[in-house]
Interface confidence: low
Amino acid sequence: EEELQVIQPDKSVLVAAGETATLRCTATSLIPVGPIQWFRGAGPGRELIYNQKEGHFPRVTTVSDLTKRNNMDFSIRIGNITPADAGTYYCVKFRKGSPDDVEFKSGAGTELSVRAKPSAPVVSGPAARATPQHTVSFTCESHGFSPRDITLKWFKNGNELSDFQTNVDPVGESVSYSIHSTAKVVLTREDVHSQVICEVAHVTLQGDPLRGTANLSETIRVPPTLEVTQQPVRAENQVNVTCQVRKFYPQRLQLTWLENGNVSRTETASTVTENKDGTYNWMSWLLVNVSAHRDDVKLTCQVEHDGQPAVSKSHDLKVSAHPKEQGSNTAAENTGSNERNIY
């Protein structure tokens, strides 16, 4: 009679993470008598996966009933596969012996490859805000995928970015891999509503890539432009001066009026108007009683935006252009929170 052969018909098996792997194995003879064991790997460091004779293997089930006398099918199923299960599995026939069974014949092995989906890409931007024209870096990370081949792309508002560097780790063989990419993006004044998207494509995703996003509103600071103007005279000796603060982002802004270099009033931007591009406009105004002044007045609108150094714009108010009334009240009425008399 021909000597027993152990046949593993599948050289390789590919399974998605979370699924069940079937590892096939048959023997060509019932003789010699003895159990089958399954191992991952070969040599002295091999790992026991299943022992027909004894032990508890909760993830492993046999395809056929190994207790039947004429059974020659020793295939197994391994449930809830993870990337850590990848490797070459050997079906090994043992001959009954005393005191221990003796290894008799091994199958050629079946390589189990595990396909694992990448985790959702996480995009993170710089810790500090940056202004338009500056280049900022964004990072994208995704983990736990297998096989190693993966494609990563960056987009800004649908336009593919080109200035990025990507690494897949580890370089050598591993049960699963991680990808890390850093992209450089040049900010523009219109980027408050912009998005940066990291897109990851992998064989496990079946053409439906994963995306991570970052809003540039969390990254950009658009500094304001200031314009100080003198409005028409509201009353004979009152002048309305406005400070237009335009196109700034984020909203955090504090404005200080100075009269000849002395602080007159400080206020925080509250009721702002939003522009289509996401930036804000705000206006502060000051009611100046010119009769309280003998000389020209230098009015300065000083703005501190988002904790940055203050910027300012000045306006020279010509007192001589406004005739003073003798005995007029130096305390002009204060008609609103944005109005202030200057003394």
């Epitope: 800004k156 970015l161 200035d163």
Partner: nanobody, 126 residues
Framework: QVQLVESGGGLVQPGGSLRLSCADS????????TGWFRQAPGREREGVAC????????RYTDSVRGRFTISRDNARRTVYLQMNSLRPEDTAVYYC???????????????????WGQGTQVTVSS
């Protein structure tokens, strides 16, 4: 202003090859995403191929994919377009362009590219 200069054009038979070069007289081409575009008589200018600043990303229009290869030598600050298996319909003036914003990679339109060379004529004819 970046000054791009193309070279390598000429007359070639169908099935032949040409290699176009694009260099910058100010030697700054390595800082920018760069594209090759072409314009045939009576037709709109179209993107042919483009390459990122680092050279790690390339893109081709469908009609040239597999026949043309874009590459760059940043040490020489030169971008190349290797054109194989040329066809009569490849006849056009070929332009090199740089995207000075550096971070777009787009060949679908040439609006992102804001610095252009004068062009080099490529004629494919028997």
């Amino acid at each position: 202003q970046v000054q791009l200069v193309e070279s390598g054009g000429g007359l070639v038979q169908p099935g032949g090859s040409l290699r176009l070069s694009c260099a910058d007289s100010e030697f700054r081409l390595d800082e920018y995403a760069t594209g090759w575009f072409r314009q045939a008589p009576g037709r709109e200018r179209e993107g042919v191929a483009c390459i990122s600043r680092s050279g790690s990303n390339t893109r081709y229009t469908d009609s040239v994919r597999g026949r043309f290869t874009i590459s760059r030598d940043n040490a020489r600050r030169t971008v190349y377009l290797q054109m194989n298996s040329l066809r009569p319909e490849d006849t056009a003036v070929y332009y090199c362009a740089a995207d000075l914003t550096s971070h777009y990679l787009s060949c679908s339109s040439y609006t992102d590219y804001n610095s252009w060379g004068q062009g080099t004529q490529v004629t494919v004819s028997s």
